[in-house]
């Protein structure tokens, strides 16, 4: 092909090539042709004769102003036609007359201001019709019943001001899953407008200035329709009362989106008419007081999003939002509750009472004063089968005994990014009999004891990154009870002292993060009592991160038990010479990181076993000694291996001898070196 199109598996991509005409030299068996972002002004039907197998044609982002009716004659199998971002202004009855197999027609962002006659009457198989971002002033798309298989009609960002039954009755035999009317200036819903449509399942009116009274009218018009999903995001619905959604009483609405409404007052029984509702989006509002009956009637809601729904009006404490006790008691089926990023004063004793099916609760950054978690804080969740609880970013400074004793089903507890500073007695976790993961990273300080985790033997993941960990060198180890642990993160704690039994018994451990500590002394032969083999027995360890610990020595047997190790990161240390058989047992190693050390020599007797099955190697920024003895074997290995070695040309440079300084290692000439073959 003379054009620069890329062709793969009957798909031709000719986008972004500044084409002014359709290429005539593509394979004739292509089924998908992408001509977007070019300079096409027309689509001559003759140019498509050779591409009769096309099922999808995308000519978006061109300057096409007219379409030849014969185009679809040449493309009898065409199912998807995308004409978005062009300059079409007129559609005649002939335009798509031969496009009888179309399932998708995209006309978004053109200049179509009016639909005359019936340009879509032949599209009996059409499923999606996108006319958004045009200048349409009405929903009138024809004069007779048509588009009986249409499921999605997208009319957002037009100039539609009224919905009229006489304009929508062309859909009398259609079942619309999605009628998208967002970002229009709709001021009127004429009587029976939605009943004109055969069945309407989804209506999207986001960014339409409805306000409370027009919303009420809308809902009355939706009475006795098939509506399931209703989206009214950013529709200036500042208040709701027990009449706002009254019309929806005669529907089976399952999804309601009221996000971004600056909603201030949610009156009692506002949603009493929605017993079938399952998904309720209320995020980004401004509710000042949730009354005990505000959510009454929502017996079937499974998902409720209240993110940033309760925000304070001013600095004054008096202006903090209020949630009455028992406000959620009606939500018997609620499984997922998101209350992130709010300004709620605290958790009251019956705040969550009645949520008997709640499994996921996010309270991240939700409270203005949740400094201490007491044994009463979560009492209202005692009868909830909660599995996941997110308490991040709440400035929590203390967890008292039995704080989570009500949460016997909890599997994941996230307490990261708080200000917790305390001795962990272990009683904090009492009652967490099914706990799988505790995330405590990024807190003020944690002092461990032998009993810190005595009551959570089911724990499989423990994250203690950057918590100024104290007493980690006690014996018995604080981690001794955690025989099911698979992930342990102790990074960024400046740990300098640990015992050889710190990880004893953790035979299921797979991931160990110890980066950014101060463990160098422990592996020095001069260490009193000799090196400390704190990795012994970790026979199932897969990932080991020891970056940035100041290591300048590695004892020969330190990795001896790590038969299943796949990834090891020893970057940003001070390693120079490694003992000959240090990696002998790492037969499964896939990734080795030794970047930014002081390694001068890469010899077979040290690195041969480690390199055997590597898929990724990082030894950048080491001061390589470019002599036969030091790197000949390495250079030959580099030039024959399939291992990925990022930035090999630019960041593997010789340091010595002086005449090789700055010279790329991979270009070192090994031909004069003897016995440097990488593979035997």
């Amino acid at each position: 092909s003379t054009t620069k199109c890329t062709v793969s598996h009957e798909v031709a991509d000719c986008s972004h090539l500044k084409l002014t005409q359709v290429p005539d030299d593509l394979p004739t068996n292509i089924t998908v042709l992408n001509l977007t972002h070019n300079q096409l002004r027309r689509l001559p039907a003759a140019n498509f004769t050779r591409y009769s197998q096309l099922t999808s044609l995308d000519v978006g982002f061109n300057t096409i102003s007219k379409l030849e009716p014969e185009l679809c004659q040449k493309l009898p199998m065409l199912k998807v036609l995308n004409l978005q971002h062009n300059e079409l202004s007129q559609l005649s009855d002939k335009t798509f007359a031969f496009c009888t197999n179309l399932t998708e027609l995209h006309l978004m962002s053109n200049s179509i201001q009016k639909i005359k006659n019936n340009p879509f009457v032949k599209q009996k198989n059409l499923i999606t019709l996108d006319l958004s971002h045009n200048g349409l002033s009405s929903t009138k798309l024809g004069t007779q019943v048509q588009l009986e298989n249409l499921q999605e009609l997208l009319l957002s960002n037009n100039k539609i001001q009224a919905l009229k039954s006489e304009e929508l009755d062309i859909f009398a035999n259609s079942s619309l899953k999605k009628l998208e009317l967002s970002s229009n200036q709709i001021k009127e819903f004429s009587p029976g407008c939605f009943h004109a449509i055969g069945r309407l399942f989804g209506l999207f009116l986001n960014n339409v200035q409805l306000g409370p009274s027009l919303t009420e009218k809308l809902c009355l018009e939706l009475a006795n329709t098939s509506i399931r999903n209703l989206s009214l995001s950013n529709s200036q619905l500042s208040t709701t009362s027990n009449t706002t959604f009254l019309g929806l009483k005669w529907t089976n609405l399952t999804m309601l989106d009221l996000s971004y409404n600056n909603l201030n007052v949610v009156g009692n029984d506002s949603f009493a008419w929605l017993p079938q509702l399952e998904y309720f989006f209320l995020e980004y509002n401004n509710i000042q007081h949730l009354f005990s009956h505000s959510l009454h009637g929502l017996f079937n809601v499974r998902y409720l999003n209240l993110k940033r729904s309760f925000t304070k009006q001013s600095i004054s404490l008096a202006s903090l939002p209020k949630i009455d006790d028992f406000s959620f008691q009606w939500l018997k089926c609620l499984e997922h509750l998101n209350m992130e990023d709010n300004d709620i004063p605290g958790i009251k004793s019956n705040m969550f009472t009645g949520l008997i099916n709640l499994k996921y609760l996010s309270l991240s950054n939700s409270f203005t004063s949740l400094r201490t978690l007491t044994n009463e804080t979560f009492v209202s969740l005692a009868h909830s089968p909660l599995h996941i609880l997110n308490l991040t970013k709440n400035k929590i400074s203390k967890i008292e005994s039995d704080a989570f004793s009500w949460l016997g089903h909890l599997e994941v507890l996230d307490l990261g990014l708080n200000e917790i500073g305390q001795e962990l007695t272990g009683q904090e976790w009492r009652g967490l009999e099914n706990i799988f993961e505790i995330y405590l990273s990024y807190n003020k300080y944690l002092q461990l004891t032998r009993n810190s985790f005595a009551l959570v033997p089911s724990l499989q993941r423990l994250m203690l990154r950057r918590v100024a960990l104290k007493n980690v060198d006690s014996s018995p180890s604080p981690f001794q009870p955690l025989r099911n642990l698979t992930i342990l993160d102790l990074s960024n704690n400046n740990i300098a002292n640990i015992n050889d039994d710190m990880l004893e018994g953790l035979e299921k451990l797979e991931i160990l993060d110890l980066q950014h500590n101060n463990l160098a002394r422990l592996w020095k032969h001069a260490n009193p009592g000799g090196p400390i083999y704190f990795l012994k027995g970790l026979s199932h360890l897969h990932i080991l991160n020891l970056e940035s610990n100041g290591f300048d020595e590695i004892p020969v047997e330190v990795f001896k038990d790590l038969f299943e190790l796949k990834i090891i990161d020893l970057g940003l240390n001070n390693l120079n010479t490694l003992p000959a058989s240090v990696f002998n047992n790492q037969v499964s190693l896939k990734s080795l990181n030794l970047q930014k050390n002081l390694i001068t020599s890469v010899e077979k007797k040290v690195f041969g076993p480690a390199f055997r099955n590597l898929t990724e190697l990082d030894m950048r920024f080491n001061p390589f000694d470019c002599t036969c003895e030091s790197i000949a074997w390495f250079v030959n290995w580099i030039n024959e291996t399939h291992t990925n070695i990022p930035e090999l040309s630019s960041h593997y440079l010789c340091n010595t001898p002086p005449h090789y300084h700055g010279f790329p290692v991979r270009l070192f000439d090994t031909s004069s070196c003897k016995d440097s073959a990488p593979f035997e």
Partner: antibody
């Protein structure tokens, strides 16, 4: 099932030493710390110390530190408690015990070894 | 060292009685308290751990309560096999001391 079987009764003279053994079975010996507890006639139980069978690390009760030595033989799955400079008040039943999955409890005990110190 | 004090040292009761034994620690032991039953010539048997958790196989008439420094063992309805000596023990920090025992006798 977990079993701790101790050596038989001993009679010792004041100033002598005694070494009591505790053979473990029904679990991996090196996995759980072994504790030693004694009980003099009509007296309360007294915790003497604990040993990590994996590496031999020990924590002693300061009261006994100068006279007690706790050791282990991993190949025999056995822990030992030796008490030296015996006095008559050391006459007691000596127990070995093991923690459970919840480590703040002794669900498993040896049957006890009576050591009598008498001249 | 944390000292454990039990009361009473002994008590007489009848079958079917409700019996309460208390144990006081000289410092906060953070609910790491166990209760044992011991019969003459036998090793102690674990009843309750972590102040209120019933050990495997222990009848539900035994219960534990309390926190911090004050703890209680309750037998709701005494059975003939319950007559024995009961000890509390803390597991907070070494040495793990025991109470002096409470001897429960038939009235």
């Amino acid at each position: 099932q977990v079993q701790l079987v101790q050596s038989g009764a001993e009679v010792k003279k004041p100033g002598a030493s005694v070494k009591v053994s505790c053979k473990a079975s029904g679990y991996t010996f090196t996995t759980y710390w072994i504790h030693w507890v004694r009980q003099a006639p009509g007296q309360r139980l007294e915790w003497m110390g604990e040993i990590n069978p994996n590496n031999g690390r020990i924590n002693y009760n300061e009261k006994f530190k100068t006279r007690v030595t706790i050791t282990r033989d991993t190949s025999a799955s056995t822990a030992y408690m030796e008490l030296s400079s015996l006095r008559s008040e050391d006459t007691a039943v000596y127990y070995c015990a093991r923690v459970g999955v919840i480590i703040t409890t002794f669900p498993y005990w040896g049957q006890g070894t009576l050591v009598t110190v008498s001249s | 060292d944390i000292q454990m004090t039990q009361s009473p040292s002994s008590l007489s009761a009848s079958v079917g009685d409700r019996v309460t034994i208390t144990c006081r620690a000289s410092g906060n032991i953070h609910n790491y308290l166990a209760w044992y039953q011991q019969k003459p010539g036998k090793a102690p048997k674990l009843l309750i751990y972590n102040a209120k958790t019933l050990a495997d196989g222990v009848p539900s008439r035994f219960s534990g309560s309390g926190s911090g420094t004050d703890f209680t063992l309750t037998i709701s309805s005494l059975q003939p096999e319950d007559f024995a000596t009961y000890y509390c023990q803390h597991f907070w920090s070494t040495p793990f001391t025991f109470g002096q025992g409470t001897k429960l006798e038939i009235k």
